[in-house]
């Protein structure tokens, strides 16, 4: 049994998350994860899910009753999702910590938008002609 | 020229994001994107970047001066990042909209944690033995 299982069970007790009513109104994450089989699609969704859990754990980081459980689960996420790669984790953390209401951050984000957009589709790296084929045709001339 | 370019230039004017000082203290997103070549790693990072822009656009959705630009850019993100797949975009939006301070959401998230963790690593689908090889060994007995 993976180590996170015991610790997740401890969190369930702490949050009363084992009660039958928790399953009411569908799932948060599981149904969404079932929808996506492609690795890159899964990463798009899991990225949001992991950032949610990190925020949740941050809110409860000073609660001694669950500290060990939270630390074990975070370590496990770092091994499984970030491949124990601290640079990957650090870059991810930077992105999740930017404040969308900070005017300097807003200006930087808008300044970088064109370059970010240019890299958004997987085909961006293989040239304009190839990308246009991927979109099953080209844009009509403006 | 892709349609988002003109609209992003319009946003730059609106946010004074063309000023030289905007480049001070490094980039928000560009340096991070340069670090990651693997498609699945890029998706992890781009997922956070796209959710940042969506939040930013939401904050300015009622401003008539940039409404058209924002709509055009959002549409382009939907084409490029979500492959014009509305279900993918909807699932993504659901994940970004969960409130981490809502106790019902917290309970659901903790309830689903074990299953979410089980699927985090790419090798999760191919069983415990294969995954342990990916970690170059197995867990020591507790």
């Amino acid at each position: 049994q993976d180590p996170y299982v015991k610790e997740a069970e401890n969190l369930k007790k702490y949050f009363n998350a084992g009660d039958p009513d928790v399953a009411d109104n569908g799932t948060l994450f599981l149904d969404i994860l079932r929808n996506w089989k492609e690795e890159s699609d899964r990463k798009i969704m899991q990225s949001q899910i992991v950032s949610f859990y990190f925020k949740l754990f941050k809110n409860f980081k000073d609660d001694q009753r669950i500290q060990k459980s939270v630390e074990t689960i975070k370590e496990d996420i770092n091994v499984k999702f970030f491949n124990s790669n601290k640079k990957k984790r650090d870059d991810f953390e930077k992105l999740t910590n930017y404040s969308v209401t900070d005017s300097n951050v807003q200006r930087k984000a808008v300044h970088e938008l064109i370059q970010v957009m240019a890299e958004l589709s997987p085909a961006a790296k293989i040239g304009k002609r190839k990308r246009s084929q991927m979109f099953r045709g080209r844009r009509a001339s403006q | 020229q892709d349609p988002y370019v003109k609209e992003a230039e319009n946003l730059k004017k609106y946010f004074n994001a063309g000023d030289p000082d905007v480049a001070d203290n490094g980039t928000l997103f560009l340096d991070i994107l340069r670090n990651w070549k693997e498609e699945s790693d890029r998706k992890i990072m781009q997922s956070q970047i796209v959710s940042f822009y969506f939040k930013l656009f939401k904050n300015f959705k009622d401003d008539q001066r940039i409404q058209k630009s924002v709509e055009t850019i959002k549409e382009d993100i939907n084409v490029k990042f979500f492959n014009s797949n509305k279900k993918k975009r909807d699932d993504f939006e659901k994940l970004t909209n969960y409130s981490v301070t809502d106790s019902n959401v917290q309970r659901k998230a903790v309830h689903e944690l074990i299953q979410v963790m089980a699927e985090l690593s790419p090798a999760a689908k191919i069983g415990k033995r294969k995954r342990s090889q990916m970690f170059r060994g197995r867990r020591a007995s507790q």
């Epitope: 993976d2 180590p3 996170y4 060990k68 939270v70 630390e71 074990t72 975070k74 370590e75 496990d76 770092n78 091994v79 491949n83 124990s84 790669n85 601290k86 640079k87 990957k88 984790r89 650090d90 953390e93 | 340069r34 670090n35 990651w36 070549k37 693997e38 790693d41 990916m134 970690f135 170059r136 060994g137 197995r138 867990r139 020591a140 507790q142």
Partner: antibody, heavy 124, light 112 residues
């Protein structure tokens, strides 16, 4: 003060087994990954194995997997490296090194703290 | 196979600047942190640079680290060379899941 102290080295014959130990102090031991790194006489550094903190996942060098086993006892602040089917080329100084605390995004640097090493000599 | 390649030896006069390179054979150097270690004879390695460009406390600012994605390499620069800098220097990075990789080492000789 962070300290890592290796022990258990010595002279063994080819084909024999040996377990070297590392006792740590000065930090919350269970939070940190621990690495074993070796250095043959007059040669460079070679990573051997790593064990994660609370989760106890084990990672091995491709060339050594199958012969070496890493384990830890968090209650005793100890890490062990069990080496079997030893060969002459395993002769080296074996260092115990503290890794990252992967539960903390502000963790101190990986491989910052090293022990003094324990010498393993494999010879007939 | 992943490799980190360093020059076997580098030398320089006191007060001068030397650069030790560390070239990654495959995979992107920018996708994993790079550390640098100094090892004097009879001592355990000591970190001089961590996470590409950061100095541990106690390491003078004569030591600096950088990463260049275009050449897929990392560099350790030592300025104002001193006789006590004479030692072996190793770069270190990662591949796969927590697989640790060391360069072959560079012997730094301070001339004069």
């Amino acid at each position: 003060e962070v300290q890592l102290v290796e022990s258990g080295g010595g002279l063994v014959k080819p084909g024999d087994s040996l377990t070297v130990s590392c006792v740590a102090s000065g930090f919350t031991f269970s939070n940190y990954f621990i690495h074993w790194v070796r250095q043959a006489p007059g040669k460079g550094l070679e990573w051997v194995a790593t064990i994660s903190g609370r989760t106890k996942y084990m990672f091995y060098s491709d060339s050594l997997r199958g012969r070496f086993t890493v384990s830890r006892d968090n209650a005793q602040n100890s890490v062990y490296l069990h080496m079997s089917s030893l060969r002459g080329e395993d002769t080296a100084l074996y260092y115990c090194v503290r890794g990252y605390d992967h539960s903390d995004s502000n963790s101190a640097a990986d491989l910052l703290h090293w022990g003094r090493g324990t010498l393993v000599t494999v010879s007939s | 196979n992943f490799m980190l390649t360093q020059p076997l030896s580098v030398s320089g006069y006191p007060g001068k600047t030397i650069v030790i390179s560390c070239v990654r054979s495959s995979g992107s150097v920018a996708s994993h942190y790079v550390q640098w270690f100094q090892q004097r004879p009879g001592s355990a390695p000591a970190m001089v640079i961590y996470e590409d460009s950061h100095r541990p406390s106690g390491i003078p600012d004569r030591f600096s680290g950088s990463v260049d994605a275009s050449s897929n390499s990392a560099s350790l620069t030592i300025s104002g060379l001193k006789t006590e800098d004479e030692a072996d220097y190793f770069c270190q990075s990662y591949y796969g899941n927590n697989q640790v990789l060391f360069g072959g080492g560079t012997k730094l000789t301070v001339l004069g």
